[in-house]
């Protein structure tokens, strides 16, 4: 048999025999096109892409539609893995999504849903999620059913504002919303209260921001 | 009254550390937290970081990250603050500073008198 | 970071006339910021937090207003102790300062 060279996620690698957390290179579905992006082996069984992390406020995450597209920051910190691949990626199977979380008082919790996709550019990246179980919460902090996604320079969200620019960061904002792990970052003493934090409603309610998020995904028949 | 007295300068050469201490006198030590503050020859001023002097409990800039170390003695009341790997750039006086609020994180009330630290080969 | 924008760098005023100094935050702050004092060889003063609320033992003729991004410092009638260095803070997200505006004697 042939030893698999390119890889479409994490679980892919994974499997192949390469079992170390750390910066891979994946391809794109049906494409020679190429992104890195931090896999995470060791938690749940492995296999996991890591899509979003959020550490401490390193990396500026108001950002463009295009920057949000394509993806930025450093896959070894901060970064958004980009909504491109993931809208690809999450189309050709069944993905769950889990999202892990910090609070600063050294407390974690993780809302997991067992089906996960992102819809194409035309409909703007709009998520869709199906069964939530985990501790962050037992109502979805992302609204549901799942809104379009908006950054600074693309308002698609439902409110007569623009919730990205008033709340900072790329989400898929209702109006706005109980969530937004792109928000500002504030360090700890600065949590409380903020509008515009990286929050989690359903967890933490409105005003806290957390200290750590991670957005990881895998194949739901790992 | 509130007062917080802070080591001699010191001159050390590039790669050498540095350990600067505040005394702090005239308020609950471990009630309020600790900054510090940098500020190079004719310069402005830079937050380096801070420290719960009663659980010990830090916080830094990211500038200095792996620099950096903020400790305290609570039998002396005294907080301190060391940075290794000195550059020239790293000459400046250094101050410490109390938190006005332990709620708000906010403004520093009282500050030290300053620690003139020179980097020189 | 947050990046705060002080003007002018100097300023120059006769003693009993107003001086008004200005300070712009990069994003939204909220209430959180403070005005220090400082003169040459010593520690910094903190003079108004709160963006308008004076601290213990600072004069009246020291007045703070503003919130968000834009905020103003404003001295009603220099007396001569009052030329020095002046720095505004942000405490909303991180602890940032101003590169200062001097006042000095026309």
């Known amino acids: 048999k042939e030893e698999q060279t390119t890889f479409r996620d994490c679980a892919e690698i994974f499997k192949s025999g390469l079992t170390t957390s750390g910066i891979y290179t994946l391809t794109f579905p049906n494409s020679t096109e190429e992104i890195k992006a931090y896999c995470d082996m060791e938690a749940g069984g492995g296999g996991w892409t890591i899509i979003q992390r959020r550490e401490d406020g390193s990396v500026d995450f108001q950002r463009t539609w295009k920057e949000y597209k394509v993806g930025f920051g450093n896959p070894s910190g901060e970064y958004w893995l980009g909504n491109e691949f993931v809208s690809q990626l999450t189309n050709q199977q069944r993905y769950v999504l889990k999202i892990h979380l910090k609070d600063w008082e050294g407390n974690e919790a993780y809302s997991l849903y067992e089906h996960f996709y992102l819809s194409s550019e035309e409909l703007n990246y709009r998520i869709h999620l199906k069964g939530l179980t985990g501790t962050a919460g037992k109502i979805s902090s992302i609204s549901q059913p799942g809104n379009d996604f908006s950054t600074k320079d693309g308002d698609n969200d439902k409110c007569i504002c623009k919730c990205s620019q008033m709340l900072t960061g790329g989400w898929w904002f209702d109006a706005c919303g109980p969530s937004n792990l792109n928000g500002m970052y504030y360090p700890q003493r600065q949590n409380t209260n903020k509008f515009n934090g990286i929050k989690w409603y359903y967890w933490k309610g409105s005003g806290y921001s957390l200290k750590a998020t991670t957005m990881m995904i895998r194949p739901a028949d790992f | 009254q509130v007062q917080l007295v802070q080591s001699g300068a010191e001159v050390k050469k590039p790669g050498a550390s540095v350990k600067v201490s505040c005394k702090a006198s005239g308020y609950t030590f471990t009630g309020f937290y600790m900054y510090w503050v940098r500020q190079a020859p004719g310069q402005g001023l830079e937050w380096m970081g801070w420290?719960?002097?009663?659980?010990?409990?830090?916080n830094h800039a990211q500038k200095f990250q792996g620099r950096v170390t903020m400790t305290r003695d609570t039998s002396i009341s005294t907080a301190y603050m060391e940075l290794s790997r000195l550059r020239s750039d790293d000459t400046a006086v250094y101050y410490c500073?109390?938190?006005?609020?332990?709620?708000?994180?906010?403004?520093?009330?009282?500050w030290g008198q300053g620690t003139l630290v020179t980097v020189s080969s | 970071e947050i990046v705060m924008t002080q003007s002018p760098a100097t300023l120059s005023v006769s003693p009993g006339e107003r001086a008004t100094l200005s300070c712009r935050a990069s994003q939204s702050v909220s209430s959180n910021l403070a005005w220090y004092q400082q003169k040459p060889g010593q520690a910094p003063r903190l003079l108004i937090f709160g963006a308008s609320t004076r601290a213990t033992g600072i004069p009246a003729r020291f007045s703070g207003s503003g919130s968000g991004t834009e905020f103003t410092l404003t001295i009603s009638s220099l007396q001569s102790e009052d030329f020095a260095v002046y720095y505004c803070q942000q405490y909303n997200n991180w602890w940032t300062f101003g590169r200062g505006t001097k006042v000095e004697i026309k």
């Open positions: 420290i719960n002097p009663n659980s010990s409990g830090t």
């Open positions: 500073a109390r938190d006005q609020d332990i709620a708000t994180a906010g403004p520093f009330d009282y």
